[in-house]
Each structure stands twice: as structure tokens, then as C-alpha cells.
């Protein structure tokens, strides 16, 4: 599912509509409609491959399918980074690559994909059902992570197909702010269109004074409140033993399965930073208990046995630490 936020040139409205609503009133609905229809959700894919030459040597490939610019990639094993996983490599597009054993060679393949070769020997070598996770921090989408592992009966030299299994690292601020504004906008748009349809249009005099609309501000929680904003995300059971289903419900909330769009406004750079944040391709949302928005009609992500839901112990803005991410 590669959907990029592309805002096409606005089509001129019908003459009757322009007369009815006026030029100013028209621009907002069209912009909102364009955003509602065209914007998409980024995704991370992970591919794990066992080398035929060295049976315990792995190649992990990860990519980011989104329109934002990547600011950092973290590859971990044994689970997501910061949630029991061990960091294997960190790749910064401008600062270079850092890696730790058993990682042997991490590299950028393209500007949005990376690969990592793991050593096959020693106490820290991976085993066949180890889970590898890739986390992409990007602007403006925020932080996205996906995990993958070899299927239990993989032949050497074969690879698991790329698994687009996005893991939630949602920034509540981004979700509530962006999704909320756009949801409101879509509802408002429908309201305007219905109103136009159901009543005659009075002639509007063009206003001489056009008061400036207040500029949208990107909302960010204070540091003190960040600790409480843990967003659950999913991963696949990791250790070298049979996987078991283990579901935790953060904050005692309900057990729920949904593909949740993550609209993290990552280091919003301007008052109108939300405008360029991707939104789901389908405009219908279903509200979930903790304030996240799940897309209606979308099946739960396909994950293997041992799906675990747990909060990020480092909080929703884990990738926005003071270091490394620029």
C-alpha cells in the first residue's frame, strides 16, 4: 500500500457554486476535500533472509514507503527498540552509520531503504525465529516501526516476503491534532455541501476586509505529560522458543485489533506543520477508546502468532530525543 500525500492543483469550482458561497468560503472546502481524498499513510516493510552460504547469517532489509524525509533508522532484534529489543544499527542520512555486533554491515541501499548483514557465529548470533525490527523516524510522519522474522520452515537462501507490518508509534498530539482537524474539516465540508444543496444561494458581496484566519499551531504535550502518553503497538514474539500469545492492555483499556494510522507530527517546524502531514486514504474513521483513530473497514494487520500489545516505555516521542535526530 504505497500512498503518498499528493495535493493536485485545485480545479476551478462551478460558476454557480462560486456565486453561492463566495471565493473565500470555497477555498477551504476544496483544500479539505483534496486532503481528505488524496493523502495516505506511510508504511515500513521488513524482509529477513537467511544466507545459503552461512546458515546462521542473516540479511535484513527495511524500507520506508512514505513521502516524508527520513531523519533516522534504528534496527533492533529481539523486539522493538526500547521495548526489550537490542539495537543493532543506527543509520542517519547525514551523520552516517553506527552498528554493533552481531551486525556486520549496515548500509543505505536507497534514500528510503537500508540493509543489514548479521554475523552468523558466536553467543549473540541470531536464530531462525528471531524478530528483527526497523524503526524509521521521518518528518512529518513521525516514527514508524515494523518487525519481521523468518518463517519457521525457511530454506536457506530463501527470504520471507517483505512484511509491511507497521507498528504503532503514534504521537497522540499528531493524531488528535491532525486527524481531528481533518475529520472536522471533512464533516464541515459535507455540511457546507449539503447546505448549498438544500437552500437557495443569496448573492454575497465581496468583503473588503478579509480578517486573517488564525494560523494553525502544532500542538505538543509538555515533557511532564509525555510519560503518560503511552501508545500501544504490536510486535511479534521474539525469542528463540515457541511463540505464545501474550496480550497486555495498557491503561486497563479494551482489547482491540485495528490498523491504526500513525500521524506523528515529528518536530513540527512551523505553525502550519499539520498541513503537510499525511492522513489516511479512506476518510471514514472509527474512534477507539484511547483517542486514536482507526480506519473503518480495514482489516487488522496480518501478524503471526504471539502478537503482543504493549506501551513504549520511552513514550510516544521516543525518536525525538535530544540526540541524533535532526
Amino acid at each position: 500500500m504505497r500512498t503518498e500525500a499528493q495535493v493536485p492543483a485545485l480545479q476551478p469550482p462551478e460558476p454557480g457554486l462560486e456565486g453561492a458561497m463566495g471565493h473565500r468560503t470555497l477555498v477551504l472546502p476544496w483544500v479539505l476535500l483534496t486532503l481528505c481524498v488524496t493523502a495516505g499513510t506511510p508504511e515500513v516493510w521488513v524482509q529477513v533472509r537467511m544466507e545459503a552460504t552461512e546458515l546462521s547469517s542473516f540479511t535484513i532489509r527495511c524500507g520506508f514507503l512514505g513521502s516524508g524525509s527520513i531523519s533516522l533508522v534504528t534496527v533492533s532484534w529481539g523486539g522493538p527498540n526500547g521495548a526489550g529489543g537490542t539495537t543493532l544499527a543506527v543509520l542517519h542520512p547525514e551523520r552516517g552509520i553506527r552498528q554493533w555486533a552481531p551486525a556486520r554491515q549496515a548500509r543505505w541501499e536507497t534514500q528510503s531503504s537500508i540493509s543489514l548483514i548479521l554475523e552468523g557465529s558466536g553467543a549473540s548470533s541470531p536464530c531462525a525465529n528471531t524478530t528483527f525490527c526497523c524503526k524509521f523516524a521521518s518528518f512529518p510522519e513521525g516514527s514508524w516501526e515494523a518487525c519481521g522474522s523468518l518463517p519457521p520452515s525457511s530454506d536457506p537462501g530463501l527470504s520471507a516476503p517483505p512484511t509491511p507490518a507497521p507498528i504503532l508509534r503514534a504521537d497522540l498530539a499528531g493524531i488528535l491534532g491532525v486527524s481531528g482537524v481533518l475529520l472536522f474539516g471533512c464533516v464541515y465540508l459535507l455540511h457546507l455541501l449539503r447546505r448549498h444543496k438544500h437552500r437557495p444561494a443569496p448573492r454575497l458581496q465581496p468583503s473588503r476586509t478579509s480578517p486573517q484566519a488564525p494560523r494553525a499551531r502544532a500542538w505538543a504535550p509538555s515533557q511532564a505529560s509525555q510519560a503518560a502518553l503511552h501508545v500501544p503497538y504490536a510486535t511479534i514474539n521474539t525469542s528463540c522458543r515457541p511463540a505464545t500469545l501474550d496480550t497486555a492492555h495498557p491503561h486497563g483499556g479494551p482489547s482491540w485489533w485495528a490498523s491504526l494510522p500513525t500521524h506523528a507530527a515529528h518536530r513540527p517546524q512551523g505553525p502550519a506543520a499539520w498541513a503537510s502531514t499525511p492522513i489516511p486514504a479512506r476518510g471514514s474513521f472509527v474512534s477507539v477508546e484511547n483517542g486514536l483513530y482507526a480506519q473503518a473497514g480495514e482489516r487488522p494487520p496480518h501478524t503471526g502468532p504471539g502478537l503482543t500489545l504493549f506501551p513504549d516505555p520511552r513514550g510516544p516521542r521516543a525518536m525525538e530525543g535530544p540526540l541524533g535526530v535532526r
Partner: antibody, heavy 114, light 113 residues
Framework: QVQLQQPGAELVKPGTSVKLSCKAS?????SYWINWVKLRPGQGLEW???????????NYNEKFLNKATLTTDTASSTAYMQLNNLASEDSAVYYC???????WGQGTTLIVSA | DIVMTQSPSSLSVSAGEEVIMSCKSS????????????LAWYQQKPGQPPKLLIY???TRESGVPDRFTGSGSGTDFTLTINNVQAEDLAIYYC?????????FGGGTKLEIK
Amino acid sequence: QVQLQQPGAELVKPGTSVKLSCKASGYNFTSYWINWVKLRPGQGLEWIGDIYPGNYSPNYNEKFLNKATLTTDTASSTAYMQLNNLASEDSAVYYCASGYFDYWGQGTTLIVSA
Amino acid sequence: DIVMTQSPSSLSVSAGEEVIMSCKSSQSLLNSGTQKNYLAWYQQKPGQPPKLLIYGTSTRESGVPDRFTGSGSGTDFTLTINNVQAEDLAIYYCQNDHSYPYTFGGGTKLEIK
């Protein structure tokens, strides 16, 4: 704000060992790696190695493989570098720096003298 | 190991002048995937730890004045300081950010007349 605290100075005898510390604060210690850098007057900066807290496989500059041992204690958010079999050429200022050398400690001056 | 060579080893200029210092690497610092050159510059003032000035050859770290400009690619890089100020008195190091071990140049000492 981000801080890396290092002791100001250590005076040790040749042939002994010393364990230098670097206490991190102001960020999540397990989110970024710690580098160690040596500075000798007139000789410039030398990268000794780096360690990611929680990953027990540090990287070393080969030149320091038998000299330095890097460890971390996540409970106290502290990184350590042990230098063994000290000699006069080990006298230098040793810095710790986090991540991509974004933040640096003030450095520990190590004096190896009989 | 990648060897980083800086020149000149020291230079003395008057305030307001322009300074250009060079850094050469024994191997290319270009990353083929990102098409970025992984070279960083640091400033070390007397009695202080080094401070990151520029990374990725030309990207200024936040808070660094735009008087400091990095350029170059492959194996040849330069740091230019326009309108030198008294507070720029320091040793400037270039660093291979490309591959282990992360080697530094010998430094260029900038003195103000």
C-alpha cells in the same frame, strides 16, 4: 538539558588500571550510544570506541583493543571505560560523547605518574 | 583506517577576515546510498570539550552561526569562516563520520591577531 558528567582528574601509577566514568542525564540513556575519545596535547583527537547501553558488544578502535574496556550501567545511566596496564603515553584528557558526538562531557584528565 | 589530514596546522588572521581550512581523507567519504559525504567539523575552544559545528559536510548544527560554511566531496573538504570573530579562537577538527574507526584530523589552530 543533556549533560555528561565526568570526574575532573585521576592520578594513577604506571602498571595499574583505572575506571573512568561518564554519567548521563537529560535524555534516555538507553536510546543513544556513548563514544570515548582521547585527546593528547599536540596529537589531536582519537576515537577509542563506542558502546550502546543494553548491547554488550562495544566497537573498538583496534589501537585500543588491549587497552580499553567499555561497559555501561543502565540503572545509574553511567558509561565506564577501564584502562589497564597504564603507561605515561596514556596520560591524556578522555572525553565521553553521546550519539553522533552531539554532546560531550567536560573530560577527565588522566595523569599516569610514579 | 581512513587517515584525515588537515592543513594548515595553524593560521593567524585578523578579526573580520575570511579563513579557509582544508581537510583531506585517504578514502572517499561518500555514501552511495544517500549520496551524502559523511564528514563532520568540530570546534574546540581552550579548556572546553569539542563542539559539533557541521555534519554531512555542509549542514550546520543548530545554533552555529552562518559564518561557518562546510563544503567539499569525496576526499577533499573545506571549512570556511567568514568575518572571523575573536571568539572563533579555537582548534578545528574534521572527522570521518563514514566508517569505523571514526578518525579525526590533526586539527587546525586558529589564532586571532
